[in-house]
């Protein structure tokens, strides 16, 4: 296993609809044809997997059916979008990249993106 640098933004603010997007960029030492990207969430020293996708030559990442993530790739950049976020989902979201093929296997883990989620205020009743 060889180490690889992964860069991601330090902070992202989710939209009022609970959507957060960020770019995860990896310094590929060669031309990988098969890449696996995993998003991990770290909160209160607990690390959980949010979503993962293996992609090849296409520009769209395909996630499992119940995933809250979507994404696209371009070169060594992966554009990730996480949906359905609420205030309780605020935390550090870490991008993990694995170059699966061809050998050698490379692994890179970013420093994480702190995603802040603010639940929208309910609209006050309006009298007309």
């Amino acid at each position: 296993c060889k180490a690889m640098h992964v860069a991601q933004p330090a902070v992202v603010l989710a939209s009022s609809r609970g959507i957060a997007s960020f770019v995860c960029e990896y310094a590929s030492p060669g031309k990988a044809t098969e890449v696996r990207v995993t998003v991990l969430r770290q909160a209160d020293s607990q690390v959980t997997e949010v979503c993962a996708a293996t992609y090849m030559m296409g520009n769209e990442l395909t996630f499992l059916d119940d995933s809250i993530c979507t994404g696209t790739s371009s070169g060594n950049q992966v554009n990730l979008t996480i949906q359905g976020l609420r205030a309780m989902d605020t935390g550090l979201y870490i991008c993990k990249v694995e170059l699966m093929y061809p050998p050698p296997y490379y692994l890179g883990i970013g420093n994480g993106t702190q995603i802040y989620v603010i639940d929208p205020e309910p609209c006050p009743d309006s009298d007309f």
């Epitope: 044809t33 090849m56 296409g58 520009n59 769209e60 979507t70 699966m100």
Partner: antibody
């Protein structure tokens, strides 16, 4: 030129298994997914699963989980799909297709499940 | 699973007509891809990533849409366009296809 050549037609009995092959040529075999799609007579297209020929990573449609196995042989640039516990509803043309975009397709293999 | 519903399922048209086929997704998807299939043949990629024409596909074919609503348009039907058309998504597993739209000569 890119080609996907599939094995010949099969007639199998209910409960049996069938192993189909898809031989790729004309491109770098390990750079693209190989997908399997089937089409029952007069019906639409149904995705069965895919394999990454380099690592062997697979994704299967849950409808087929437990019944389908996809493997590859990089030395011959061939992908195999085995479907077990066959029933009459599995009678269909089975296609392999390349990549994320399904830009090249095999000619199809007709599988008939009949007693 | 993401369901894709095509409308209409059957369409009768004449050479030279402009026709539009719609693909509706049960959940928002990033892209839609379109395939053409003729009887006894394997499907053929027409349009990928919603609007990009595959190699060798005539410019009378076009695709558009976003989110849950997508369309395939043929600006002026040619005799060789009479076939069945399928949309497909690959945003989430399992990859799914629409039920197909059969385009017939009026």
């Amino acid at each position: 030129q890119v080609q996907l050549v599939q094995s010949g037609a099969e007639v199998v009995k209910p409960g049996a298994s069938v192993k189909l092959s898809c031989k790729a040529s004309g491109y770098t075999f390990t750079s693209y997914w190989i997908n399997w799609v089937r089409q029952a007579p007069g019906q639409g297209l149904e995705w069965i699963g895919r394999i990454a020929p380099g690592s062997g990573t697979t994704y299967y449609n849950e409808m087929f989980t437990g019944r389908v196995t996809m493997t590859r042989d990089t030395s011959t640039s061939t992908v195999y799909m085995e479907l077990s516990s066959l029933r009459s509803e599995d009678t269909a043309v089975y296609y392999c297709a390349r990549g994320d975009y399904f830009d090249y397709w095999g000619q199809g293999t007709m599988v008939t499940v009949s007693s | 699973d993401i369901q894709l519903t095509q409308s209409p399922s059957f369409l009768s048209a004449s050479v030279g007509d402009r026709v539009t086929i719609t693909c509706s997704a049960s959940k928002s998807v990033s892209y839609i891809h379109w395939y053409q299939q003729k009887p006894g043949k394997a499907p053929k990629l027409l349009i990928y990533d919603t609007s990009t024409l595959a190699s060798g596909v005539p410019s009378r074919f076009s695709g558009s849409g976003s989110g849950t609503e997508f369309t395939l348009t043929i600006s002026s039907l040619q005799p060789e366009d009479f076939a069945t058309y399928y949309c497909q998504q690959r945003t989430t597993y399992p990859l799914t296809f629409g039920q197909g739209t059969k385009l017939e000569i009026k």
